[in-house]
């Protein structure tokens, strides 16, 4: 029986050009984590396998860094990075657990917007 739960950072926002850490945590289970996939619906970003280590997709090699821990750091963000990201924990003996993070990449910070409209 699968007793575990995935905690994620949930809905997050970051600034264009900046970076963000995608983080999931599996709790309430003694199952062994053997692999963690980081995916979008249509493609793999990265895999952390207990035996093989990290694999980063060539499409993301320049701007994805493994970690911290089983998390993933996305760098040089663009507005096209807005969307859903999923962590998939492969465990034994439970099976797979999936967590969802929605990332919104903003054009610029609120502070910058504010500065543009200051009265001289």
């Amino acid at each position: 029986m699968m007793t575990g739960t995935i905690e994620t950072t949930g809905n997050i926002s970051a600034e264009k050009g900046g970076s963000i850490i995608l983080q999931c945590h599996l709790s309430s289970t003694t199952a062994q984590v053997t692999q963690v996939n980081w995916e979008q619906q249509d493609q793999l970003l990265a895999i952390c396998n207990a035996d093989l280590g990290w694999h980063i997709s060539p499409s993301f090699k320049d701007r994805v860094a493994p970690g911290p821990g089983l998390g993933l750091t996305l760098q040089s963000l663009t507005v096209n990075d807005t969307g859903e990201y999923f962590c998939i924990y492969h465990t034994y003996p439970d099976g797979t657990y999936t967590g969802r993070i929605f990332l919104e990449v903003l054009e610029s910070s609120v502070a910058e917007h504010g500065a543009r409209f200051q009265i001289p």
Epitope: N37, D42, L44, L52, P58, T98
Partner: antibody
């Protein structure tokens, strides 16, 4: 238990449109997952066509992009395939299937044979 | 597109034998390979995902291994009911692609 069932005409004329329905029972298509269409040609080759996600996003095989459309009716828990300008090369068994992240196609319909012929 | 190649279209084996089916990806797909079994007149049935993980209820005589570009599906002791076509599939990136299939024939 999750079940998928394809339905639609078994015979379509060349240059016409092929329209199929996948009815899902035991799970809401708006809850999670990507809901796919896959076809199998007479020689047994399997060909992924496209999907619609639980949130309504679609993605298609580039080889079909100009001809394919996948839509859904959430009130009936159904999703649909429309393939335009069919030729005899589109003769195949068409399957709908659920894809789970980090895995593969975990649930399949029983398939429906569509023959394109004049 | 990522091309998945199953070099053997047919394999002949006897009940009780060990048989291995291979699949090669045209690029590194890490461990994102699934295996399916299709019996005559039926839809494909998922057996293995992420190269080596068995789905619930799949007998433990079925195993998968490999990473990168080379993958193997093994039946440790073939049973008569294993007569089927076996397909590999990459779930690395769209378009998801399948191997051409290997038909297992029982002698």
């Amino acid at each position: 238990d999750v079940q998928l069932q394809e339905s639609g005409p078994g015979l379509v004329k060349p240059s016409q449109s092929l329209s199929l329905t996948c009815t899902v029972t035991g799970y809401s298509i708006t809850s999670d997952y990507a809901w796919n269409w896959i076809r199998q040609f007479p020689g047994n080759k399997l060909d992924w066509m496209g999907y619609i996600t639980y949130s309504g996003d679609t993605r298609y095989n580039p080889s079909l992009k100009s001809r394919i459309s996948i839509t859904r009716d959430t009130s009936k828990n159904q999703f649909f395939l429309r393939l335009n300008s069919v030729t005899t090369e589109d003769t195949a068994t068409y399957y709908c299937a659920r894809r789970e992240l980090g895995q593969g196609f975990t649930y399949w319909g029983q398939g429906t044979l569509v023959t394109v012929s004049a | 597109d990522i091309v998945m190649t199953q070099s053997h279209k047919f394999m002949s084996t006897s009940v009780g034998d060990r048989v291995s089916i291979t699949c090669k990806a045209s690029q590194d797909v890490s461990t994102t390979v699934a295996w399916y079994q299709q019996k005559p007149g039926q839809s494909p049935k998922p057996l293995i995902y992420s190269a080596s993980y068995r789905y619930t209820g799949v007998p433990d005589r079925f195993t998968g291994s490999g990473s990168g570009t080379d993958f193997t599906f093994t039946i440790s002791s073939v049973q008569a009911e294993d007569l089927a076509v076996y397909y590999c599939q990459q779930h690395y990136s769209v378009p998801w692609t399948f191997g051409g299939g290997t038909k297992l024939e029982i002698k």
